[in-house]
Amino acid sequence: LKGQEFAPSHQQVYAPLRADGDKPRAHLTVVRQTPTQHFKNQFPALHWEHELGLAFTKNRMNYTNKFLLIPESGDYFIYSQVTFRGMTSECSEIRQAGRPNKPDSITVVITKVTDSYPEPTQLLMGTKSVCEVGSNWFQPIYLGAMFSLQEGDKLMVNVSDISLVDYTKEDKTFFGAFLL
Amino acid sequence: LKGQEFAPSHQQVYAPLRADGDKPRAHLTVVRQTPTQHFKNQFPALHWEHELGLAFTKNRMNYTNKFLLIPESGDYFIYSQVTFRGMTSECSEIRQAGRPNKPDSITVVITKVTDSYPEPTQLLMGTKSVCEVGSNWFQPIYLGAMFSLQEGDKLMVNVSDISLVDYTKEDKTFFGAFLL
Amino acid sequence: LKGQEFAPSHQQVYAPLRADGDKPRAHLTVVRQTPTQHFKNQFPALHWEHELGLAFTKNRMNYTNKFLLIPESGDYFIYSQVTFRGMTSECSEIRQAGRPNKPDSITVVITKVTDSYPEPTQLLMGTKSVCEVGSNWFQPIYLGAMFSLQEGDKLMVNVSDISLVDYTKEDKTFFGAFLL
């Protein structure tokens, strides 16, 4: 674009017009998690409320079995917050004892599973060391970004430790996506 | 949708087309807070700058008296960041003294008031224990998600302690919403 | 709006209709940073991957030399996450030694550079004191909000200390923007 002006935007309409109210959208909220088996070295996926309270899915965006199903190719904004809470990690004690100190951590990953690729793709990760002095701690990790998705892709939220997730309130832990 | 392909998207236009530049939008920025009365057990609401600097409201989205006013029903993306700062909570000392240690905390809530429901609805909450070792601490809490709102709904941002909010810069503490 | 109901939205179409798939959009992901000179008292800017992996630019949104170039005036949602990691700051030791304690900190700023204004404008800032007990710490700072931008504006992400940025994974540190 060096030395050129930007092309006028009215020349740029290459895609069909689309009613906004018709776009796939979902906002899912936390529910109490039932322990499920997950493979070693793979973070467990959260499951979600999809129709009660603040939660909804619309315009062919469906939720099933921990996955948001993408009904239409396009650019989506995807977001999640997970609130964690727990007892103090022992890192301060470990440190005082002179042992090497690898702090505990909390991690959220938004993962895409797609037919066209054998491995799940990590779209977003929020990870934080937890080395608190107080005896009870709690904190959120928030993630959000835009991705190009294909019809049939599936999205899930994985966490490092499902037992630390605060499932008590729908406004504390949630997951959503919408077609731009 | 089991066993079926997704319906083609061009068959899905059920809503009227809409010019994007006409959608209700607002980005509000922090101002110095004047102490206001608030009810016990209810977090105080922040008030905001709505027209100076980076702040704006447009397309019938109005700001008045701590509230963003929703002029049109639809799905909105709502976000806020609040930066807190304070002196160290005493939890490390409390712990050393052997007393039970309930850490201090900071909380942000984005709240909806609607005339179709008698009590305010908490849409988003970010809450974090604060148990810092350093004598001065500061940190942001960010929230954002999509919600279905009704014409006439009102949005506000509540915080656990208004005196801890960093009001010094418009880029540190803010609140916004836009119709998708 | 005094004493009036909201005007019906179908009377509000002042802008031309626009195909969503044609809007400027970008999602950039972290790369290993090469040390670059930066002015004292000015945070260094990150540079980014713009086409490999999850990264993309489209519809005349271009990336060059640390900047996202805005090709069209309008309201944009802009976001970034930067994951930091480091060794423990010495603040707890400093405190124990009785010296005044200015905690270390990590900061992310999304900055706009515009022809029509001589100074860069800080759009978003996330700043956090770091005073960890554990010997190795890591944590993200997430930012996102909507801004009115002009054709030709440039966006960058600045950080307080480029050596603390986790550049190892594209899902940990990223930067994006899209026209609403």
Epitope: - | S116, P118, E119 | E5
Partner: antibody, heavy 116, light 106 residues
């Protein structure tokens, strides 16, 4: 504590305008919505309309919309109801109601008789 | 308008009886509200959002239902429960009330 107090003339002539005022105390009424509901003798409850005191945005019962106006005066913490062209059928107890903050609160009601 | 059809219009029951009132909306609503009105008094909110008990309301009162069919129950009728009970929907414009159910003691 939270209180809503309706006031106004107890007698209005036919074809005149009924005017009532609701004075609120104990809460910031801009944080809520204020409604008017009436109850005609021996009848059920009828919602008339509401105002958002923060924005002055109003909604009215379509059956009354041509005759009813709700306004507010934030400096006095008051909400007013005006019902024009009244007839005997508008004889009722008129209630001011707060919603949007729990518990919803009703005034004690103001009986207005339309008679010549 | 969303029509609210409340039944029965009146009932007579003994102290300690379980009393049930139903309300049917002409179209689906998310939230239903139940009020108690004693003679010469303003209505008092008992149930909001279909099933949430308002502050200070005895636990013998409950609500249930969704969509178009809602139920209000007094698990054990007390003498002080003599009143007229109304359902109300707060979503469509206008807000509409049921015609009321007058509860008396046998």
């Amino acid at each position: 504590q939270v209180q809503l107090q309706e006031s106004g003339p107890g007698l209005v002539r036919p074809s005149q305008t009924l005017s009532l005022t609701c004075t609120v105390s104990g809460f910031d009424f801009q944080d809520t919505y204020m409604h008017w509901v009436r109850q005609r003798p021996g009848r059920g409850l009828e919602w008339m309309g509401r105002i958002d005191p923060a924005s002055e945005h109003t909604k009215y019962n379509p059956s009354l919309k041509s005759r009813v106006t709700i306004t507010r005066d934030t400096s006095k913490n008051q909400v007013s109801l005006r019902l024009s062209s009244v007839t005997a059928a508008d004889t009722a107890v008129y209630y001011c109601v707060r919603s949007g903050g729990l518990p919803d609160v009703w005034g004690q009601g103001s009986l207005v008789t339309v008679s010549s | 308008d969303i029509q609210m059809t409340q039944s029965p219009s009146s009932l007579s029951a003994s102290v300690g009886d379980r009393v049930t009132i139903t309300c049917r909306a002409s179209q689906g609503v998310r939230y239903m509200y139940w009020y108690q009105q004693k003679p010469g008094k303003a209505p008092k909110l008992l149930i909001y959002g279909a099933s949430n008990l308002a502050s200070g309301v005895p636990s013998r009162f409950s609500g249930s239902g969704s969509g178009t069919d809602f139920t209000f129950t007094i698990s054990s009728l007390q003498p002080e429960d003599i009143a007229t009970y109304y359902c109300q929907q707060w979503e469509g414009n206008p807000r509409t009330f049921g015609q009321g159910t007058k509860v008396e003691i046998k």
